[in-house]
């Protein structure tokens, strides 16, 4: 007998052919050999089976014998062996129904799991391989788990249930909620204005919650409360700043935060915590912030950088247009008895600038 | 075993609108089509139509337009509406189920009965 | 709708005697037709499904046959408790239909 594979609240047709192609009587039949739907003369007639409502056929095609039953929003319980009686003869086809679902909402935060639930016919045993939507192979049976989830798991997942060298393709949206990026420096000089973004890397209808930043100075033995918020409906308003800093923020998405100087007090690391409405857990994004300060002082040319910064980052002090440099794997460099010109202050990672400050020194008669 | 148990008042005004409920005990609500029959004094069965918690539910042509069915899953309770009644609609009113297995359909248990009469 | 006729529409026998009820469908409804008594003030119950199948606790003496459109229903031998109402109700296409009933009195 012919397997059919359906999923859980698609539509199903399973097709039944009599050899002359003229319209004749058929019936449709489940296994306990009550009526689903049949002709009589021209018009189509249903059974009492629980199918009676969600059952249909292509009558546009019965003058051609074929006499199709088409189910629709199919159910794990109607798999069952359904008959078709043409032309004396009967046709069976068992119908198996499938549904995956994910076990929680599909709108999940990063680091949470992913539990994949199958639901199959009494009697069957697939198996079940997913694709995530960065390449990812899951392989599995009843259940699917994804332990940690990471934003690049946010996408279409595509899963194939295999029965009787059979498949059926389902697809799964999920959404990771996550910040776009994980970690984010910004690079300043003194007394610039520092602008901090934190884009999403998902887009909700409603989006509620309430965030903080907190911050770590360097330069501080503890951490503190920068500033708190709420948002609503992607509206955003503050609810409590600090005296010092006085940072200011966007009203509107992305959440945008701006410093109005860099100064060396200020250089640390912070974390931007958002806890959304209905959600257990809190998105993070930890910023950075380097402050690089160039100044003269007697006969002392001194730069000097504050703030989390690699070893791996180079400090220099150049003479424009001349070969005269000191460069340093640390945090401060300096020049004694500098000659005039000006002088470029480089924060550089392999060759990379990120950051770059100049200081005239004019000559001491 | 299941037992059904019409309810429902005995008088209803013409033109208004009949309410009944039937209660289920014994089982569950779940997975059975559930059927409204009617039996005006000395006269033949009337299948009103039938509910499931699964499906839509399926009514007699000749009442449609003024038949509601429903189901309370939590109460193991289904209901008829039928509106606008007149005089003919003056009967017995039985819920039953019904039930199918191998070549086997048909109304196993039914409730004993609510007598409806339709006057002002 | 199919219409279901039942004769006949009432009938007089003894204790003993064998009857026979005949029910027509207006097309063919192969064997999905069953039988039920009813007695007075108390609700239906089913006797015979598909046609020809006993239901269970039900006395053997009653018995149903045919397919299509042409069925009958018998009792082999009539018993005092047997005096009721039949019906056929036919179940091959929505909405289910019942014949008028035969009435079965004591003579």
């Known amino acids: 007998k012919k397997v059919v594979l359906g999923k859980k609240g698609d539509t199903v047709e399973l097709t039944c052919n009599a050899s002359q192609k003229k319209n004749t009587q058929f019936h449709w039949k489940n296994s306990n050999q009550i009526k689903i739907l049949g002709i009589q003369g021209l018009f189509l007639t249903k059974g009492p089976s629980k199918l009676s409502d969600r059952a249909d056929s292509r009558k546009s095609l019965w003058d051609q014998g074929c006499f199709s039953m088409i189910i629709k929003n199919l159910k794990i319980e109607d798999s069952d062996t359904y008959i078709c009686e043409v032309e004396n003869k009967k046709e069976e086809v068992e119908l198996l129904v499938f549904g995956l679902t994910a076990n929680s909402d599909t709108h999940l935060l990063e680091g949470q799991s992913l539990t994949l639930t199958l639901e199959s016919p009494p009697g069957s045993s697939p198996s079940v391989k997913c694709r995530s939507p960065g390449g990812k192979n899951i392989q599995g049976g009843r259940t699917i788990s994804v332990p940690q989830l990471e934003r690049q798991d946010s996408g279409t997942w595509t899963c194939t249930v295999s029965q009787d060298q059979k498949t059926v393709e389902f697809k799964i949206d999920i959404v990771v909620l996550a910040f776009q990026k994980a970690s984010s420096t910004v690079y300043k000089k003194e007394g610039e204005q520092v602008e901090f973004s934190f884009p999403l890397a998902f887009t909700l209808e409603k989006l509620t919650g309430s965030g903080e930043l907190w911050w770590q100075a360097e330069r501080a033995s503890s951490s503190k409360s920068w500033i708190t918020f709420d948002l609503k409906n992607k509206e955003v308003s503050v609810k409590r700043v600090t005296q010092d800093p006085k940072l200011q923020m966007g009203k509107k998405l992305p959440l945008h935060l701006t410093l109005p100087q860099a100064l060396p007090q200020y250089a640390g690391s912070g974390n931007l915590t958002l806890a959304l409405e209905a959600k257990t857990g809190k998105l993070h994004q930890e910023v950075n912030l380097v402050v690089m300060r160039a100044t003269q002082f007697q006969e002392n040319l001194t730069c000097e950088v504050w703030g989390p910064t690699s070893p791996k980052l180079t400090l220099s002090l150049k003479l424009e247009n001349k070969g005269a440099t000191v460069s340093k794997q640390a945090k401060a460099v300096w020049v004694l008895n500098p000659e005039a010109g000006m002088w470029q202050c480089l924060l550089s990672d392999s060759g990379q600038v990120l950051l770059e400050s100049n200081i005239k020194v004019v000559p001491t008669w | 075993q299941v037992q059904l148990q019409e309810s429902g008042p005995g008088l209803v005004k013409p033109s208004e609108t009949l309410s009944l409920t039937c209660t289920v005990s014994?089982?569950?609500?779940?997975?059975?089509?559930w059927s409204w029959i009617r039996q005006p004094a000395g006269k033949g069965l009337e299948w009103i139509g039938r509910?499931?918690?699964?499906?839509?539910?399926n009514y007699n042509p000749a009442l449609k337009s003024r038949v509601t069915m429903s189901v309370d899953t939590s109460k193991n309770q289904f209901s008829l509406k039928l509106s606008s009644v007149t005089a003919a609609d003056t009967a017995v009113y039985y819920c039953?189920?019904?039930?199918?297995?191998?070549?086997?359909?048909?109304?196993?248990?039914w409730g004993q009965g609510t007598t409806v009469t339709v006057s002002s | 709708d199919i219409q279901m006729t039942q004769f006949p529409s009432s009938l007089s026998a003894s204790v003993g005697d064998r009857v026979t009820i005949t029910c027509q469908a207006s097309?063919?409804?192969?064997?999905?037709l069953n039988w039920y008594q009813q007695k007075p003030g108390k609700a239906p119950k089913l006797l015979i499904y598909?046609?020809?199948n006993l239901e269970s606790g039900v006395p053997s003496r009653f018995s149903g046959r045919g397919s299509g459109t042409d069925f009958t229903f018998t009792i082999s031998s009539l018993q005092p408790e047997d005096f009721a109402t039949f019906y056929c109700?036919?179940?091959?296409?929505?909405?289910?239909?019942f014949g008028q009933g035969t009435r079965l009195e004591i003579k």
């Open positions: 039953a189920r019904e039930l199918e297995r191998l070549n086997y359909y048909g109304m196993d248990v």
């Open positions: 014994g089982g569950s609500i779940s997975r059975y089509y």
């Open positions: 509910i499931c918690t699964s499906e839509n539910p």
């Open positions: 097309q063919d409804i192969s064997n999905y």
């Open positions: 598909d046609a020809s």
């Open positions: 109700q036919q179940y091959d296409t929505l909405p289910i239909t």
